[in-house]
């Protein structure tokens, strides 16, 4: 906390300009009027104040706006944003996408900080849903943003926003998140033709159910092994050897390299060895000929 001292003669700031970088912290506190600072916030970012000096400027704004800064000030915070705590940000009402972009720009190239996470949370809650423009902006700055949301939060993403999602935005999503996003993507891309549809839906397929995978197997999609390995195990298990062969097309040969890994390993255990042999890949571990497979889970469901 900077001591309250009188401003030295002739040092009272008439505007926010470069001369202020030569002021000591106590001089900034004594000589810069908070209301002047608020009206000329757009200048602060262009002036190379030290982080210690920025602390003083923040203190002045905090005194002027104890209930939280108005958006006209927030939009021009620039580097001063790095001095804000999540508690400060929770007092804000940020409604403009331009304000959000301006503040994300300051943090560009860094990990998502608690301040940024709080800012985004405030913004999205204020809007009521993650619309396409917001999602576009957030994923441009933080490709992993979507996967940082809980399934509950993802449920507020309208299908129209899915168009903004790039494959790399889903890299860190887990199956629970893809379970929520996949039906939205299916709805968003439903009017596209086969090959175009597959290109768009591919990165969401970790949330696809068996029936959709069966349908895709009839469309000559040639799914790559990386995509296949991300499918839900419970969705892959009921697929027949013929369906997997059609689904993967020329990539089916890749199953051999993945035979010890899920979901391939578990799928092999469910197939008849005879059927696996038709692939000519030397896959082992299927059900031997002459064995009868009883699906106990099905039996329990019936009783």
């Amino acid at each position: 906390e900077v001591e309250k001292t009188a401003c030295p003669s002739g040092k009272k700031a008439r505007e926010i300009d470069e001369s202020l970088i030569f002021y000591k912290k106590w001089e900034l506190e004594a000589c810069v009027d908070a209301a002047l600072l608020a009206t000329q916030m757009d200048r602060v970012n262009a002036i190379p104040f030290t982080y210690e000096q920025l602390d003083v400027l923040k203190h002045k704004l905090d005194e002027l706006y104890p209930q939280g800064y108005p958006e006209s000030v927030i939009q021009h915070l620039g580097y001063l944003f790095l001095k804000m705590s999540p508690e400060d940000i929770r007092k804000w009402n940020v409604t403009s996408l331009e304000t959000l972009k301006a503040l994300l720009e300051v943090n560009k190239g860094h990990e998502m900080s608690p301040q940024v996470a709080t800012l985004i949370d405030r913004f999205v809650k204020g809007r009521g849903q993650l619309d396409k423009d917001t999602l576009d902006t957030l994923t441009a700055f933080y490709p992993g943003y979507l996967c940082s949301l809980s399934p509950e939060e993802l449920s507020s993403v309208p299908p129209s926003s899915i168009w903004a999602v790039r494959p790399q935005d889903l890299d860190t999503c887990d199956p629970r998140q893809l379970d929520v996003l996949y039906p939205k993507a299916r709805l968003a891309f439903q009017n596209m033709n086969g090959s175009e549809y597959f290109v768009k839906i591919q990165s969401f397929l970790g949330g696809a159910p068996t029936e959709d995978l069966k349908a895709l197997s009839q469309q000559n999609v040639s799914m790559d092994l990386a995509t296949f390995m991300k499918l839900r195990t419970d969705a892959v298990l009921p697929l027949t050897v013929a369906e997997v062969q059609k689904l993967l097309g020329p990539h089916v040969e890749g199953l051999k390299a993945e035979e010890r890994h899920r979901p391939v390993r578990d799928w092999i255990l469910r197939q008849r060895q005879d059927d696996l042999d038709t692939l000519g890949l030397g896959l082992q571990g299927g059900i031997p000929n002459g064995y009868l497979v009883l699906d106990l889970s099905m039996q329990e469901a019936l009783s």
Partner: nanobody, 115 residues
Framework: EVQLVESGGGSAQAGETLRLSCTAS????????MGWYRQAPGDECELVST???????NYADSVKGRFTISQDNAKNTVYLQMTSLKPEDTAIYSC?????????WGQGTLVTVSS
């Protein structure tokens, strides 16, 4: 990695002259605005002088007319010529790129002026 190495500090009598040097590496020196900061014992950090990439200079009121900042782009070095030294100029002097916003931090070079 940005590196700034200050030198030229030492002891001087009031009224004497010292020249500080700061040699930079790891960034585009001729595109950068540079500054000299100082911190006296028990006092807070203070910006002494700046020089911008176009060569324009600025000074704190307390050193105007006594200190001169300059730079040699070929040597990636910024200088602070300090004349008519006063005891109140005693401090650790550090040079910084203004974009770093750091101020007084790191080693610096100690200047001690006795009356």
């Amino acid at each position: 990695e940005v590196q700034l190495v200050e030198s030229g500090g030492g002891s001087a009598q009031a009224g004497e002259t010292l020249r500080l040097s700061c040699t930079a590496s790891g960034f585009t020196f001729d595109d950068s605005d540079m500054g000299w900061y100082r911190q006296a014992p028990g006092d807070e950090c203070e910006l002494v002088s700046t020089i911008s990439s176009d060569g324009s200079t600025n000074y704190a009121d307390s050193v105007k007319g006594r200190f001169t900042i300059s730079q040699d782009n070929a040597k990636n070095t910024v200088y602070l010529q300090m004349t008519s030294l006063k005891p109140e100029d005693t401090a650790i002097y550090s040079c910084r790129t203004m974009a770093s916003r750091i101020g007084c931090w790191g080693q610096g070079t100690l200047v001690t002026v006795s009356s």
